[in-house]
């Protein structure tokens, strides 16, 4: 067990041109806060995958109001560290996401509004117990400077926080099979930490986090007796005849979840699903209010003014979950038309359109010819590859200003061969195609046994049916 600690040093405009506008103004004062999300390993995980190592939210920073005409300075930061406790071993390699959030303090209906200012992410190697590591990350025009470290919580030590150290019981040496704890030579290595909840009477471990059962016991936590009973009694051992497995007391027996939480068994022990307003391993921590900022990703917190009343997070588009912690993959609906690339930015969907298309969903086919003149006798049409102009023989380029090979733009469709001719280019069509540019199949794949061709899209160079 241990704690990952993050210290934010500064958040402000990065070097170079294009300084960002201040996020706050005299009309809309605001303050910053930060969220950190940690995941084990170096995998290139999606931003919305769970923060398996943990997450933390900073306090709110001081209120900031922009000075008119002044460039955006480094913004005032919240006090203190962001701390992410981890229960198991520190993985050594981890991925992080640090989000900078703005809380606007204007006169919004329903209280303050939150919006994501910047998100940085990275993958790092880090040994627990080491010194602070410094880092600089840029997100757009913003720059975030921070330090981080992982430290073990006593009695755990080591680069993964898996070794335990306890004060020596005898002044001279450690117990049998236990070594002194470097660098704490006055302490001794303690036995391994088994899986949480592993039965101290019936279970043991040889590796941190495991739970191996003594003979006669089973289950993930060695709490289930293996009995050879007739299986008539619901629990407990019985006469040795039939060799049945009788469940012993399960981890959810007696419901360890407080405050109305529901218990479900897991391979490791149990898990509590807590009602709104409670959290913790056993739903024992209460008193989350809107003042604690429980809604992530710009969710609006309503109710929960006092610890006894539940809060509700109203999530912005693209997020769901009781705390708006889950991102909806809106790109899976393929909202971008005409081959546009979908980008889910969290606060909005963006479509990055292919050349020649525009609009929020790339739904508009641009009129490339509007206000465009073609030189050297060219005529403006959309077509023939990337050219906006259909150029006269011997000219090419976007505006027909360059002397060029008229066949370079592949002007003949469906595998037609292009020839430069004194009167212009000539397409020699492949068998079965006709038209000045071979764009018309004479009999489109036309077996008479085919049903009337279905509507819609057919890749056409060469033409084929899907």
């Amino acid at each position: 067990a241990g704690v990952f600690e993050l210290q934010i040093h500064s958040f402000g405009p990065g070097p170079g041109p294009g300084a960002p506008r201040s996020p706050c103004s005299a009309r809309l004062p605001c303050r910053l806060f930060f969220r950190v999300c940690l995941k084990p390993g170096l995998s290139e995980e999606a931003a919305e995958s769970p923060c398996a190592l943990g997450a933390a939210l900073s306090a709110r920073g001081p209120v900031y109001t922009e000075q008119p005409g002044a460039p955006a300075p480094d913004l005032p930061l919240p006090d203190g560290l962001l701390q992410v406790p981890f229960r198991d071993a520190w993985p050594g390699t981890f991925s992080f996401i640090i989000e900078t959030w703005r809380e606007e303090l204007g006169d919004q209906i329903g209280g303050p509004a939150w919006s994501l200012l910047a998100r940085v992410a990275g993958r790092r190697r880090l040994a627990a117990g080491g010194p602070w590591a410094r880092d600089i990350q840029r997100a757009g025009a913003w720059e975030l400077r921070f330090s981080y470290r992982a430290r073990c919580e006593p009695p755990a030590v080591g680069t993964a926080c898996t070794r335990l150290c306890r004060p020596r019981s005898a002044p001279s040496r450690c117990g049998p099979g236990l070594r002194p704890c470097a660098p704490l030579e006055d302490e001794c290595e303690a036995p391994l930490v088994c899986r949480a909840g592993c039965s101290p009477e019936h279970g043991f471990c040889e590796q941190p986090g495991e739970c191996r059962c003594l003979e006669g016991w089973t289950g993930p936590l060695c709490t289930v007796p293996v009995s050879t009973s007739s299986c008539l009694s619901p629990r407990g051992p019985s006469s040795a005849t039939t060799g049945c497995l009788v469940p012993g007391p399960g981890p959810c027996d007696g419901n360890p979840c407080a405050n109305g939480g529901s218990c479900s068994e897991t391979p490791r022990s149990f898990e509590c699903t807590c009602p709104r307003g409670f959290y913790g391993l056993r739903c024992e921590v209460s008193g989350v209010t809107c003042a604690d900022g429980p809604c992530f990703n710009g969710g609006l917190c309503v109710g929960g003014a006092d610890p006894d009343s539940a809060y509700i997070c109203h999530c912005p588009p693209g997020f769901q979950g009781s705390n708006c912690e889950k991102r909806v993959d809106r790109c899976s609906l393929q909202p971008c038309r005409n081959g546009g690339l979908c980008l889910d930015l969290g606060h909005a969907l963006r479509c990055r359109c292919r050349a020649g298309f525009a609009g929020p969903r790339c739904e508009h086919d641009l009129d490339d010819c509007a206000g465009r003149a073609c030189a050297n006798g060219g005529t403006c049409v959309e077509g023939g590859g990337a050219h906006r102009c259909s150029c006269a023989l011997g000219f090419g380029g976007r505006d027909c200003r360059e002397r060029a090979d008229p066949c370079a733009a592949r002007p003949c469709a469906h595998g037609g061969r292009c020839y430069a001719h004194f009167s212009g280019l000539v397409c020699a069509c492949a068998p079965g195609y006709m038209g000045a540019r071979c764009e018309f199949p004479v009999h489109p794949d036309g077996a008479s046994a085919l049903p009337a061709a279905p509507p819609g899209l057919r890749p056409g160079d060469p033409q084929r049916y899907l």
């Epitope: 490339d368 005529t379 049409v381 469709a413 000045a436 540019r437 764009e439």
Partner: nanobody
Framework: EVQLVESGGGLVQPGGSLTLSCAAS????????MAWYRQAPGKKRELVAG???????IYIDSVKGRFTISRDNAKNSVYLQMNSLRAEDTAVYYC???????????WGQGTLVTVSS
């Protein structure tokens, strides 16, 4: 993606006239080479008439002088004016588009033309 919707088909007597319309969406017809095809029962689909992106037209021999293909950029539509219709013109007529930028082809659903007395 380009969508094509044909209309104007129906029953007509030999020697009569019909005009087929093909309304395009998703791209301007000025940017497309468009054509009309037809498929009679038990036969291959065949090209009838085409109009290139630059406005040049093409017809198969059996309809030359009787059919005219045209384009209306403002209405984003292509038309096939069919005069002096014959029984052998009976078929399902399909609108076709070739998009130069993507080099993809598109088809409409088809409209039935029946020439019968």
């Amino acid at each position: 993606e380009v969508q094509l919707v044909e209309s104007g088909g129906g029953l007509v007597q030999p020697g009569g006239s019909l005009t087929l319309s093909c309304a395009a969406s998703g791209s301007s017809v000025r940017f497309l080479s468009m054509a009309w095809y037809r498929q009679a029962p038990g036969k291959k689909r065949e090209l009838v008439a085409g109009i290139s992106a630059d406005g040049s037209t093409i017809y198969i021999d059996s309809v030359k002088g009787r059919f005219t293909i045209s384009r209306d950029n403002a209405k984003n539509s292509v038309y096939l004016q069919m005069n002096s219709l014959r029984a052998e013109d009976t078929a399902v007529y399909y609108c076709y588009a070739y998009r130069w930028r993507t080099r993809y082809t598109y088809w409409g659903q088809g409209t039935l033309v029946t020439v019968s007395s």
